[in-house]
C-alpha cells in the first residue's frame, strides 16, 4: 500500500527506520518558493510555517477567477511530497513556505530573487540548522537567478531545483543551470524520462540526477484530507529535497558537495532508456535516478567521484571550454570530447586559485566538451605537472616526482592543428607504472594526488576490431578518477567517464580504415581511499 | 553553466547625446545588459541592477539615487522596487527602457538584467 | 469484520486527565492506509472532532482542543489512546473511536469515518 | 473554521413518506461532505459520502446531493428503521458536523 514513487526512493531498510521516528525531532528545515500552501491539511498541519512572504505578479485576464484551492493546488502538493505526514518522502520535516508564484503558477525572477533573499535574511536573523531551498519553478536563463543561488548556497544552504518541463536542455532554464544547485529530472514508474502532453523532462549537463516526477500521490489542497496526482519535475526536485533533508537529519554536518556526491553514488544507475533524449544530449545527461543514500558511517570513507562536462565550445578554431569542479572538490583529471573527433586535447590550468579542465578544439571541429573528474579527497594535496611537446618521434614522460603523490589522471594537448601527422598520446602501466606517456606534439598533463590512504592503479581494454566504442570499468571497492583513450587508429572522438565506467569513442570512419594491430584502448585510473594505508600506486 | 547559453546580452554602451555632465562622460560604459531569450517571458520595464560584488550598502543606494536623479533631469520618473543588500548588491527599478543606456554607465554597475517570468514546473 | 471498542473510567474530576483506550479487532491498527479518530457529543448535542492518528504515531488535532489532547498508539497492542487534559464540566460527552481511510489509497475506501466504536459515556464531576 | 447549519431540527413525517433534510456550510465545502445517521444510544453510521455516493449496505432509498454550500439527503419512502438523527459532516477544512436533524414519527 505504499505509493510506487516512495517505493522506487527508500530502500526497504529505510522504511523501518523512518517507522522509528514518526514526527522526527529534525531541526532540517525545508523553504518551498512556491504558489500559496493549505497549511490546514492533514499531511502538513502542524510541521509548515506559511510566511508572510507574498511576491508574485498579477494574474493574466479580466475573468480570471481566484480560488484558494486551485491558488494553493501546486505548493500544497510539493509540501506534502516533501514532508507529508502519509506520502511524505521526510515525513516530519519542518517547511516553511514563501509565496513567489500566483494562482496560475507564474512568478517572476525579480520575485524568486526577493524571495532568496528573504530566506538569507532570516539565516543572518535566526541561524538555525541546515537548511534545504526548493526551487520547483523555471524561467529562462537569468544569470542574477543563477548568482544569487551561488551566493546563497556558499553560505550552506543546500538549493534543488527542478530540471524544467519543456523537453529541453536544462542549462537554457534558471535557477536549473546553476551548478550550484541539485538539478532534477522526472522519470515514471519504469524509471523512464517523464513525457508531459508534448513536451517533457528537461535533459542533459545541467541534470544532476532524476526522481519519480510522474503520477506522484500528494496533498490536495481540494481537502484537508483529499490526496491527488501530480506530474513534473517540481514533484521529482521535491523527492530529492525530501531525500536530502533526511540525509541531514541524520548527518547535520554534510556538504552540499558531500550530499550531491552521496546522491549521485547512491542513485540507481542505467535504468533510463536514454533514447529518449536527443542524439546529442545522450552522453551529457545522467543515467540516475535518486534513492535515499545510507548514512556515511555504514559506508566508510569512500572515494566519490563524479563527472561534470563543460558547455559545448562553438566551432571556432580557437574555441575552448572548460569544467569546473565544486570548491570542496578535486579535480583529479580532465578529458576531452568532439563528435567531429577534431579536437585538441586537454589540459589542466589554474584560474582564480581553482584548478579547472579545458579542452580545446581543432580546426574544422565542430566543437569540444571539456570531461572533469571531481572527487571528494579528505585532506587531499593535488598538484599537476606538465612537460611541452617533445621534438619529432620523441615520447613525453610525466610521472609524479613528490613522495607518496598518485598518479589520477593524465590529459594530452596537442600543439599542431593538423590531425594527421601527430600519433596520439599513450598510458602504459606495463612498462612505466604511474607515468603519463604522450607523442610526437603533445605536451602532457599529469594528476598528481597525495591523501591519506590513497592508492591507485592503470586498467586498460583494447579492442582491435570495428567497434565505436571501447569501455573499461574499475572493480568493486575502486573509484575511476581518470579516462582516456589510447588510439591505433588516427582518429577518436575522446574519452569520458560514466559512473565507473571509462568510455572512449572512435570515430565511424576511424572503424573502417583500421587494420588488426591497432588497437584502441581505454585507459582508466582506478583509486581507492584506505585511511589505514598510506598513498601507492598499485602495478 | 558557466558559458550564457541561449541568452541575450546586449552591449548598450553608446554615449547618450545629452549625457553632457562630466561625471557622466567620465564614466565609458562596461556593464551589459540581458534579457531572457524567450521574448514572451519578458518583462520589459522593470530591471534588476547588478552591481560589483564588493560595492558596499551605502553605495548602493546611491546608485539607485543617482539613477533617480539622472532620469528626473531627462523628465523621467523611476521607481526603485526594492534593494538587494544580502545575497547580491543592486536594486529593482521600474523605469523605460529608454534609461537603459544611462543606467549601464553608473559607477559600481556590472549588469542590468531585464525582469522575466518563472513558471511553476 | 473490523469492530472498535473504547474503554476508561466513566468519572473523571475537574483539572484531572480523561484518559480513554480504544482496541481494534477483525484488523490491524498498523496499517499504512488508515487514521484512527476520537470523536465526542456532549449529551443531547452534536458530534465533535478531537483528533486523528496513524500508525506510525503521526497526530492532527482539532485545533479549538490541541493544547490539552494528547493521542498515541500501541501497534503490538492493536489500540490506540486519548488523553484529554485538565478536564471541566464541558467534557462530559459520549467518546466515540473511529476509521478513518487515509486516502493515500484511494483503494481503501471512502475517505470518512466509518466503521465507529460503540461510545463510552465519561461525566466531569467533583 | 466552517460551520454547517442542519434544517429544520426536527423533521416530523410518517412512514412511507419523503424525507428532505438539507445542510448549508458557511462556506464552500465542494463535494466533501458526508451524512451519518444515529439512532438512540448507538454510534453514527455512515450514510452518504462525497455529497452523493452511498456507502456499502446503504439503501438505495437514500441519496444525496448537492455541492458548495447547499447539500441535500433524501430518503425517497420512509422506513420505520429510517426514523433517527441524521448528521452531516465536512472535510473541506479540518472536520466539522453539523448540528442534527431528527426524523420523528408524526
Known amino acids: 500500500s505504499i505509493p510506487w514513487n516512495l517505493e522506487r526512493i527508500i530502500p526497504a531498510w529505510h522504511q523501518t527506520e523512518e517507522d522509528r521516528s514518526p514526527d522526527g525531532s529534525s531541526q532540517v528545515e525545508v523553504y518551498l518558493l512556491d504558489t500559496s500552501i493549505q497549511g490546514a491539511h492533514r499531511e502538513i498541519e502542524g510541521r509548515v510555517t506559511i510566511t508572510d512572504f507574498n511576491s508574485v505578479p498579477e494574474e493574466d485576464g479580466t475573468r480570471f477567477h481566484r480560488q484558494a484551492s486551485k491558488c494553493d493546488s501546486h505548493g500544497t502538493h510539493l509540501a506534502g511530497v516533501v514532508s507529508g505526514r502519509d506520502a511524505g518522502v521526510a515525513k516530519g520535516t519542518s517547511l516553511h513556505s514563501l509565496r513567489v508564484l500566483n494562482c496560475q503558477g507564474k512568478g517572476t525572477v525579480s520575485g524568486t530573487l526577493i524571495g532568496l533573499e528573504f530566506i538569507r535574511k532570516s539565516q543572518l536573523i535566526q541561524p538555525s540548522g541546515p537548511l534545504v531551498v526548493l526551487l520547483p519553478l523555471a524561467g529562462g536563463y537569468s544569470r542574477i537567478l543563477n548568482a544569487a543561488c551561488r551566493h546563497l548556497a556558499r553560505t550552506g544552504v543546500v538549493l534543488v531545483a527542478a530540471a524544467g518541463n519543456f523537453r529541453d536542455d536544462a542549462c537554457l532554464y534558471s535557477p536549473a543551470s546553476a551548478p550550484e544547485v541539485i538539478t532534477v529530472g522526472a522519470t515514471n514508474a519504469q524509471d523512464q524520462p517523464v513525457t508531459l502532453g508534448t513536451l517533457g523532462t528537461n535533459f542533459g549537463r545541467c541534470v544532476d540526477l532524476f526522481a519519480p516526477g510522474k503520477d506522484i500521490i500528494g496533498a490536495s489542497s481540494d481537502c484537508s484530507t483529499c490526496f491527488m496526482s501530480q506530474s513534473g519535475t517540481s514533484q521529482a526536485a521535491a523527492h530529492v529535497a525530501g531525500i536530502v533533508a533526511r540525509m541531514l537529519s541524520r548527518e547535520p554536518t554534510l556538504t552540499l558537495a558531500e550530499l550531491r556526491q552521496r546522491l549521485i553514488h547512491f542513485s540507481t544507475k542505467d535504468v533510463i532508456n536514454m533514447a529518449w533524449f536527443p542524439e546529442d544530449q545522450q552522453v551529457l545527461t545522467p543515467n540516475l535516478v535518486a534513492t535515499l543514500p545510507p548514512s556515511t558511517h555504514e559506508t566508510g570513507g569512500q572515494l566519490l567521484c563524479r563527472t561534470v562536462w563543460s558547455a559545448h565550445s562553438g566551432p571556432t578554431r580557437t574555441a575552448t571550454a572548460t569544467a569546473r569542479c565544486a570548491p570542496e572538490e578535486e579535480l583529479l583529471s580532465c578529458s576531452s570530447f568532439s563528435r567531429s573527433g577534431r579536437r585538441r586535447g586537454d589540459w589542466i590550468e589554474a584560474i582564480g586559485g581553482q584548478q579547472v579542465c579545458k579542452a580545446l578544439n581543432a580546426f574544422g571541429g565542430e566543437g569540444v566538451y571539456a570531461v572533469a573528474r571531481c572527487c571528494l579527497v579528505p585532506r587531499a594535496n593535488c598538484s599537476i605537472h606538465n612537460t611541452p611537446a617533445a621534438r619529432a618521434g620523441l615520447e613525453t614522460h610525466v610521472h609524479c616526482h613528490q613522495k607518496d603523490h598518485v598518479l589520477t589522471g593524465c590529459s594530452f594537448h596537442w600543439e599542431v592543428e593538423d590531425l594527421s601527422v601527430r600519433r596520439q598520446p599513450a598510458l602504459r602501466s606495463r612498462r612505466q607504472p604511474g607515468q603519463c606517456v604522450g607523442h610526437q606534439a603533445a605536451s602532457v598533463y599529469a594528476s598528481c594526488c597525495h591523501a591519506p590512504g590513497l592508492e591507485c592503479k592503470i586498467k586498460e581494454h583494447g579492442i582491435s576490431g570495428p567497434s565505436e566504442q571501447v569501455t573499461v570499468a574499475c572493480e568493486a571497492g575502486w573509484t575511476l578518477t581518470g579516462c582516456n583513450v589510447l588510439p591505433g587508429a588516427s582518429l577518436t572522438l575522446g574519452a569520458y567517464s560514466v559512473d565507473n565506467l571509462c568510455v572512449a569513442r572512435v570515430h565511424d570512419t576511424a572503424r573502417a580504415d583500421r587494420t588488426s594491430g591497432e588497437a584502441t584502448v581505454a585507459a582508466a585510473i582506478c583509486c581507492r581511499s584506505r585511511p589505514s594505508a598510506k598513498a601507492s600506486w598499485v602495478q | 553553466q558557466d558559458e550564457d547559453g541561449d541568452y541575450e546580452e546586449l552591449m548598450l554602451a553608446l554615449p547618450s547625446q545629452e549625457d553632457g555632465l562630466a561625471d557622466e562622460a567620465a564614466h565609458v560604459a562596461t556593464a551589459t545588459f540581458r534579457r531572457c531569450s524567450k521574448e514572451a517571458w519578458r518583462l520589459p520595464g522593470t530591471y534588476i541592477v547588478v552591481l560589483m560584488e564588493e560595492t558596499q550598502r551605502l553605495q548602493i543606494e546611491q546608485t539607485a539615487h543617482r539613477l533617480q536623479t539622472r532620469a528626473a533631469r531627462r523628465g523621467y520618473v523611476i521607481k526603485v522596487l526594492h534593494i538587494f543588500y544580502d545575497l547580491f548588491p543592486g536594486f529593482l527599478v521600474k523605469m523605460s527602457s529608454d534609461l537603459l543606456g544611462l543606467a549601464l554607465k553608473l559607477p559600481h554597475v556590472e549588469y542590468i538584467e531585464e525582469d522575466s517570468f518563472v513558471f511553476a514546473q | 469484520q473490523l469492530q472498535l471498542q473504547e474503554s476508561g473510567p466513566g468519572l473523571v474530576k475537574p483539572s484531572e486527565t480523561l484518559s480513554l483506550t480504544c482496541t481494534v479487532s477483525?484488523?490491524?491498527?498498523?496499517?499504512?492506509?488508515?487514521?484512527w479518530t476520537w470523536i465526542r457529543q456532549p449529551p443531547g448535542k452534536g458530534l465533535e472532532w478531537i483528533g486523528s492518528?496513524?500508525?506510525?504515531?503521526?497526530?492532527y488535532y482539532n485545533p479549538s482542543l490541541k493544547s490539552r489532547v494528547t493521542i498515541s498508539v500501541d501497534t503490538s497492542k492493536n489500540q490506540f489512546s486519548l488523553k484529554l487534559s485538565s478536564v471541566t464540566a464541558a467534557d462530559t460527552a459520549v467518546y466515540y473511536c473511529?476509521?478513518?481511510?487515509?486516502?493515500?489509497?484511494?483503494?481503501?475506501?471512502?475517505?470518512?469515518?466509518?466503521?465507529w466504536g460503540q461510545g463510552t459515556l465519561v461525566t466531569v464531576s467533583s | 473554521e466552517i460551520v454547517l447549519t442542519q434544517s429544520p431540527a426536527t423533521l416530523s413525517l410518517s412512514p412511507g413518506e419523503r424525507a428532505t433534510l438539507s445542510c448549508r456550510a458557511s462556506q464552500s465545502v465542494s463535494s466533501y461532505l458526508a451524512w451519518y445517521q444515529q439512532k438512540p444510544g448507538q454510534a453514527p453510521r455512515l450514510l452518504i459520502y462525497d455529497a452523493s455516493n452511498r456507502a456499502t449496505g446503504i439503501p438505495a432509498r437514500f441519496s444525496g446531493s448537492g455541492s458548495g454550500t447547499d447539500f441535500t439527503l433524501t430518503i425517497s419512502s420512509l422506513e420505520p428503521e429510517d426514523f433517527a438523527v441524521y448528521y452531516c459532516q465536512q472535510r473541506r477544512n479540518w472536520f466539522t458536523f453539523g448540528g442534527g436533524t431528527k426524523v420523528e414519527i408524526k
Open positions: 477483525g484488523g490491524s491498527i498498523g496499517s499504512s492506509s488508515y487514521y
Open positions: 473511529a476509521r478513518e481511510n487515509s486516502g493515500v489509497v484511494p483503494a481503501a475506501g471512502p475517505n470518512w469515518f466509518d466503521p
Open positions: 492518528i496513524n500508525y506510525r504515531g503521526s497526530t
